[in-house]
Amino acid sequence: QRLPRMQEDSPLGGGSSGEDDPLGEEDLPSEEDSPREEDPPGEEDLPGEEDLPGEEDLPEVKPKSEEEGSLKLEDLPTVEAPGDPQEPQNNAHRDKEGDDQSHWRYGGDPPWPRVSPACAGRFQSPVDIRPQLAAFCPALRPLELLGFQLPPLPELRLRNNGHSVQLTLPPGLEMALGPGREYRALQLHLHWGAAGRPGSEHTVEGHRFPAEIHVVHLSTAFARVDEALGRPGGLAVLAAFLEEGPEENSAYEQLLSRLEEIAEEGSETQVPGLDISALLPSDFSRYFQYEGSLTTPPCAQGVIWTVFNQTVMLSAKQLHTLSDTLWGPGDSRLQLNFRATQPLNGRVIEASFP
């Protein structure tokens, strides 16, 4: 499936459900622990203050030790913006010492800008993508991913952080947005809706997709996530929309089949390594790109967002498993964890294809 940019592209199915994005910000590496805050239903989103869920908890990356052959990733608080006014927000709390973004949720208090002033910034994420208004940029070459195929051992940590399900990625997953724009993948997480209600963070012509995957990367110019936060291009997120298709997606099933084990907020399990690139669309050449922010507190800006034109297909059962298995704080289901779309404020979204 592809987004409807050109006439020959498949039209988007279904209209926007009207539900707004709760978890919208791209998950930062280790966004797991970041709280996401969205406006409660009925509350108007304040300009620039829309739900910016901080990316999922970002892991802190330290310089590689040759002996260990791997980087150390530590959770770094990430901020996502509050969700759409119409969408209920789930509470997600972080209890990390020294983390001033410890308490945020989708909807309700505290307003995200109070959690992190950056959430009221002018260049926030997610945004609504209008393909016909995107600027074709021939310089945007196909994305390059290296080392995303992982053997089953050692296993990877899959965690319910209260506002998303996050898979912590090992060192060595390299991604290039272009010459000299090199990154290392830190973590991936998902945003979803509820039964019959879509939950992607980004939208296309106002259409919200059932779900969205975010793979959070740290620029190789930085050794740690906290050094990169707020720096232009310091973080990059690859985002893809998840849609319903007729067949089970075997790559996603390797993760979805383990969600029952982490139904409780804060729980985690170990899953065999897998081909991470199989979770993304196969067409790395057609995408939209813009500079935005984390979609959860701290809502740091300067994040390069790359949104694939091609979508990923999951079965109806898989999408149901994603949206109906996990629990957040306070006996509430972990659902509608997306942030409302944010104003472009003059930003131009670029497209890698005409």
């Epitope: 052959g69 080392g147 195929q149 053997p151 089953p152 050692p154 090992p170 065999p272």
Partner: antibody, heavy 119, light 110 residues
Framework: QVQLVQSGGGLVQPGGSLRLSCAAS????????MSWVRQAPGKGLEWVSA????????YYADSVKGRFTISRDNSKNTLYLQMNSLRAEDTAVYYC????????????WGQGTMVTVSS | QSVLTQPPSVSGAPGQRVTISCTGS?????????VHWYQQLPGTAPKLLIY???NRPSGVPDRFSGSKSGSSASLAITGLQAEDEAHYYC??????????FGGGTKLTVL
């Protein structure tokens, strides 16, 4: 220092059984996946079996599936390989190795223990 | 027969540069899985020499380097020394759910 010390090898008749042990020290054993790799006399290396850090997932080469069982006791920092229905072609030096490298490499190896299957 | 193919032997004079190739298939190296190299001196256990295609663990001299392209990989040794005489094995992961090795290459320092 980081090391893997093996024991349990020896001479066994075809159809017999043997249990190999691999004691780890100097690193957090319970956090690492482990494997067994063997080397027949004068031959190359052959991966035999692997086990996840918590012992919940195991993998076997087709040549030993159904006959060998890998296990671990994290409280004792020890890895095991139970070998049943041994055949002459199982004769080899058996190495335990740490599967901890995130890219799938074996970065720490035991000293090896010889298993001879002969009548 | 090994899943990964290596030349049985290579040789070189001290100070020279030698390379050892390792050829796989679309289910292992060609599928994107990393290649690792081990050195095995006579009568000893293998030692990790290169991991993740081109990374050296600490303590391994920079005379050793690795590279990967498509379904094959290679190990290069420059400034050959007598103590480099050993067997060298490449290793990767295969989609058949197994870790696979090459047959090994005996390096002789003339």
């Amino acid at each position: 220092q980081v090391q893997l010390v093996q024991s349990g090898g020896g001479l066994v008749q075809p159809g017999g059984s043997l249990r190999l042990s691999c004691a780890a020290s100097g690193f957090p054993f319970s956090s690492y996946a482990m494997s067994w790799v063997r080397q027949a006399p004068g031959k190359g290396l052959e991966w035999v079996s692997a086990i996840s850090a918590n012992g919940g997932t195991t993998y076997y080469a087709d040549s030993v599936k159904g006959r060998f069982t890998i296990s671990r006791d994290n409280s004792k920092n020890t890895l095991y390989l139970q070998m049943n229905s041994l055949r002459a072609e199982d004769t080899a030096v058996y190495y335990c190795a740490n599967n901890g490298n995130y890219r799938g490499a074996f970065d720490i190896w035991g000293q090896g223990t010889m298993v001879t299957v002969s009548s | 027969q090994s899943v990964l193919t290596q030349p049985p032997s290579v040789s070189g004079a001290p100070g020279q540069r030698v390379t050892i190739s390792c050829t796989g298939s679309s289910s292992n190296i060609g599928a994107g899985y990393d290649v690792h190299w081990y050195q095995q001196l006579p009568g000893t256990a293998p030692k990790l020499l290169i991991y993740g295609n081109s990374n050296r663990p600490s303590g391994v001299p920079d005379r050793f380097s690795g590279s990967k392209s498509g379904s094959s990989a290679s190990l290069a040794i420059t400034g050959l020394q007598a103590e480099d005489e050993a067997h060298y094995y490449c290793q990767s992961y295969d989609r058949s759910l197994s870790w696979v090795f090459g047959g090994g290459t005996k390096l002789t320092v003339l």
